[in-house]
């Protein structure tokens, strides 16, 4: 797999010396979570008569939250570790000036991987030990000397699982946008057999190759709005745990039987993929169980058939496609592969031929969407917890996440000079980058209005001189009179307002008599009640869409389809003078107040809806007894 003269395996290649573009200046003390490899990096490659500029971003979602590695220790015992501080050197990105381009590379020891421009797939790998600036070979997949590989999944095994194959099903989506649905996640467990381990020579080499492969697979699936996240890697560095046969169907059966036995003590995952160094019989390089994703049979076997890891990545993407319900393209009448190059094939072609595919056909996408409608696909919906992802959150997504000081979007979008868009850290000398109380990269002085009062139940908020964010929105004390009612958590709930909210502008509160009884399931009037805090009763307006109603005389109540539950009068609604609905009963306003809260605010604030002092501009919480400037001076801290 890694011979001493890699170029001996290429028919034609071009020698390039990649040039790394200088990144934006960053603060000298980079946070430790940024690791040794930068968050983003760009390279210029002169190849095929063009200067290609590759913009790459570290794939921070490559490894799942509880990522584990399992191997055999020197004493023969099986060891499972959760590696700490998992910095890595696997990147994804695009080529500048080519809208539909893609790139997936590792930068660990020189550049290795692929970049796609239009219909051309370029592979790159180092020719010597010169690192990222040294000599590299850039070549097209068809110039890699290898035999064509086929998938062992037969038409017979597909037929009953996939249903009729007609051209009419496959309507191409307009443009090349992602499918309009939730991003799905495949939590992947990879097993590497002993033959592959022997071929690569060390755990480190295996780990590097597997991460490279999964990075490529993830990039291929992103076009389908999928992410492939590695949650576990098992390396059989001592001996195989089951017989890996040259017959791929036998090996798959053995893998799935072994996996079923291991499931209780191994990582929970959606899919298992074996990478083997065993040469499968004939031209077969992969075999999978069709439509098995999320089941106990969710898995496939892949022969590492090519010197370049992109080869086994394409095989894995293909076999995982079968797990996701996809058929071979050539089995589907009217199937369109939008590859434009000569003999271009898509990922689900039965044979990969001499060039690696880089996209899914229209029919693969249709099969996938169909599979996702099945209840079994639910395991793909759970998004990884970003706060736990090894490698951390995503810089450039407009969310300030763990370890980030700011996030102004991708570099192409960011116009915020206070934030370094490449690292999501504050620019040199900046105190802040976002927030209503941040101006010109500095925190605004205490007392500046940052959120005006929006109605009679609201309170205005002021900057505190220390934080770039406006303080949390606070409201008038519950029970403060407002138009026709009493303030409650910032709202002014009245029966009339509630009826309008559901029934539209013509909605009104029903007659008082409508509120004098409760309703039992099945729209039956029941026992008398003495207040207006039961079921919300309205008249007039338009019946809300998708809601069932219960009509008794002129009283209209909203109910569930089965008539067992009713829309209640909300908490805080006025039910009489100085009275509000509270816990289903009409009670005195004093239920809101445990004490005279405002007396604690030293005449420099009022009580809010949380029974806390809300200070006037420039005064410090909690009791508005001191000026903010005095408090800051005493603590001696900068914002």
């Amino acid at each position: 797999i890694a011979p001493s003269r890699p170029w001996a395996l290429m028919e034609q290649y071009e020698v390039v010396l990649p040039w790394r573009l200088p990144g934006p200046r960053v603060r000298r003390a980079l946070p430790s979570h940024l690791g040794l490899h930068p968050e983003r990096v760009s390279y210029v490659l002169g190849a095929t008569g063009h200067n290609f500029t590759l913009h790459l971003r570290k794939n921070r979602d490559l490894l799942g939250s509880g990522y584990t590695e399992t191997y055999t220790a020197a004493n023969g015992s099986e060891v499972t570790e959760q590696p700490r501080g998992q910095d890595h050197c696997f990147y994804q990105g695009h080529v500048e000036g080519y809208p539909d381009s893609a790139a997936s590379l590792s930068t660990c020891a020189g550049l290795r991987g692929f970049f796609q421009v239009g219909s051309d797939l370029h592979l790159i790998e180092p020719l010597d030990e010169g690192g990222e600036g040294g000599r590299h070979a850039v070549y097209q997949a068809e110039h890699l000397l290898q035999t064509a590989g086929t998938c062992g999944v037969s038409d017979d095994s597909l037929g009953s699982l996939l249903g009729p194959r007609t051209a009419a099903v496959f309507r191409p989506r307009p443009g090349d946008s992602l499918p309009s649905r939730e991003t799905r996640y495949v939590e992947l467990y990879v097993v590497v057999d002993n033959a592959e381990f022997q071929m690569l020579g060390s755990e480190a080499a295996v780990r590097h190759r597997v991460l490279e492969v999964v990075n490529h697979v993830d990039k291929l699936y992103q076009k389908l709005n999928f992410r492939v996240v590695l949650v576990g890697l098992e390396i059989w560095n001592s001996q195989d745990r089951f017989h890996v046969s040259p017959d791929p169907s036998v090996t798959l059966e053995n893998l799935l039987t072994w996996q079923a036995r291991q499931r209780t003590r191994r990582h929970l995952h959606d899919n298992v993929q074996l990478i083997t160094g065993v040469d499968f019989t004939g031209t077969t390089v992969g075999f999978a169980r069709v439509s098995a994703m999320c089941s106990h049979s969710s898995g496939a076997v892949n022969q590492d058939h090519s010197k370049n890891p992109v080869g086994v990545a394409c095989t894995m993407a293909h076999e995982m496609g079968h797990n996701l319900g996809m058929d071979h393209d050539e089995n589907v009448q009217g199937c369109r592969c939008q590859e434009r190059f000569e003999a271009g094939r898509c990922i689900m072609a039965g044979s990969i031929g001499s060039s690696f595919p880089r996209m899914f056909s229209d029919c693969s996408q249709a099969y996938l969407e169909s599979f996702l409608e099945r209840p079994q696909s639910v395991c793909l919906a759970n998004a990884p917890d970003l706060s736990h992802l090894v490698g951390g959150p995503v810089c450039g997504n407009l969310f300030v996440e763990r370890g980030e000081q700011c996030d102004c979007g991708p570099p192409e979008d960011c116009r915020n000079r206070c934030c370094n868009s490449t690292t999501c850290q504050l620019a040199e000398g900046a105190q802040c980058a976002h927030g209503t109380c941040c101006q010109e990269c500095k925190v605004k002085p205490a007392g500046e209005l940052c959120r005006p009062k929006k109605d009679m139940c609201d309170l205005e908020e002021f900057c505190d001189g220390r934080h770039p964010e406006c303080p949390e929105d606070a409201f008038q004390e519950n029970g403060t009179p407002c138009s026709g009612g009493y303030c409650y958590n910032g709202a002014c709930p009245t029966l009339a307002q509630q009826c309008q909210a559901f029934w539209g502008p013509g909605g009104q509160a029903a007659e008082e008599s409508c509120f004098s009884y409760d309703i039992l399931p099945g729209c039956k009037a029941s026992r008398y009640r003495a207040d207006m805090c039961g079921v919300l009763q309205c008249k007039g307006g338009q019946q809300p869409l998708g809601r069932a109603i219960c009509i008794v005389d002129v009283c209209h109540a909203l109910t569930t389809e089965d008539g067992t539950a009713y829309e209640p009068v909300p908490e805080g609604t006025r039910c009489g003078p100085e009275k509000v609905c509270w816990k289903g009963r009409c009670q005195d306003l004093h239920v809101y107040r445990s004490s005279n809260c405002s007396a604690q605010c030293h005449n420099h604030g009022v009580c809010n809806h949380k029974q806390e002092c809300h200070c006037h501009a420039g005064w410090a919480p909690p009791h508005c007894a001191k000026l903010l400037t005095e408090v800051h001076a005493a603590s001696g801290s900068l914002p």
């Epitope: 309009s180 991003t183 992103q222 709005n225 979007g409």
Partner: nanobody, 124 residues
Framework: EVQLVESGGGLVQAGGSLRLSCAAS????????MGWFRQAPGKEREFVAA?????LYADSVEGRFTISRDNDQNTVYLQMSSLKPEDTAAYFC????????????????????WGQGTQVTVSS
Amino acid sequence: EVQLVESGGGLVQAGGSLRLSCAASGRTFSNYVMGWFRQAPGKEREFVAAMGDTTLYADSVEGRFTISRDNDQNTVYLQMSSLKPEDTAAYFCAARSRFIPPLTFRTGGAYDYWGQGTQVTVSS
């Protein structure tokens, strides 16, 4: 599947204000970058603003429009002030998963879900 429903459009005089709302349902709202786009008759769809925790604006609306969101209410807002006749357009709300950042949030192709739109007409 995320459903987006815009409201709040209407006819307003130049210099006036309007507040658009976009109610989202179906998925965890806080996992989405929310965007506003607009399209005037016979013109290309144009980026207006986007928001995660932080915000982006088109140069043409910076200082006049404010995007905000309420994760508890699953709603994103576009407060439009100092409106001009050239702001007349159909306004669309869009959502994009936060887990795969695009190259830019300023193009429609970056977003996974779209609302049906609400019309804003600014008269002179």
